[in-house]
């Protein structure tokens, strides 16, 4: 399966949905995580099926939020949110699977300027 | 190690009531939730229901309203009340610990057969 940016770049302060395509129908558990891979990446969130329940992890902000489709969604996004994401994904083999994605922020721009003009 | 043992099981008519019973031994995570699952003949296994250490509870569309889930934390046991059984609750219900943080690692017990008929 593979991750996808909705938008691709989002100015801060909007909301990014981090998409995740293709993916089995059979899964258990999702486990999103801040980084290249999961293996020693903080959890940001998890969704369990079977209990239909959000389950938060030490780098959970309260502006994330993962849906039953294995989705994030982030809500109100800082410039410190840009970088790498990992969805680890269990199915009901017990087998697990990840896929890594990239959300890209950029600034908001000050109105009246033009783009590149720097605000005195 | 967690170990799980079963019990409660048996053969009853429609419209009846049975109470199973889950001890576990072992160290349960706080992060653990306690459940029941159910395979019958043919059939994957599904989820039941299920319990936090917190008491928070989850349920299968199919048995809420008809089946109670609840929880003895300093006993390590977990109990699922079941009434108005219908022939389609015949199944083999598992007994499960899970870990909200690593779901794929999971401990099953062996099983008690419950018979619904009609």
């Known amino acids: 399966f593979t991750i996808e940016a909705l938008p691709s770049s989002a100015a801060e302060g909007k909301d990014v949905l981090l998409l995740a395509c293709n993916i089995s129908e059979t899964i258990q558990a999702y486990y999103w995580h801040k980084g290249k891979t999961a293996e020693g990446s903080p959890l940001i969130a998890g969704y369990i099926t079977d209990i239909q329940a959000n389950i938060p992890g030490a780098a959970y902000s309260g502006r994330e939020t993962v849906y039953p489709n294995g989705s994030l969604l982030f809500q109100n996004i800082t410039l410190e949110d840009a970088g790498s994401y990992t969805l680890r994904t269990i199915n009901a083999s017990y087998d697990s699977d990840q896929a890594t994605g990239q959300l890209h922020v950029h600034q908001n721009n000050v109105p009246g300027l033009p783009v590149g003009a720097v605000a005195g | 190690q967690v170990q799980l043992q079963e019990s409660g099981g048996g053969l009853v008519q429609a419209g009846g009531s049975l109470r199973l019973s889950c001890a576990a031994s072992?160290?349960?995570?706080?992060?653990?939730?306690m459940g029941w699952y159910r395979q019958a003949p043919g059939k994957e296994r599904e989820f039941v229901a299920g319990i936090s250490y917190g008491s928070t509870t989850y349920y299968a569309d199919s048995v809420k309203g008809r089946f109670t889930i609840s929880r003895d934390n300093a006993k390590n046991t977990v109990y699922l009340q079941m009434n108005s059984l219908k022939p389609e609750d015949t199944a083999v219900y598992y007994c499960a610990v899970r870990d909200l943080y690593v779901w794929d690692h999971a401990y099953w017990g062996q099983g008690t057969q419950v018979t619904v008929s009609s």
């Open positions: 072992g160290t349960i995570s706080r992060s653990s939730i």
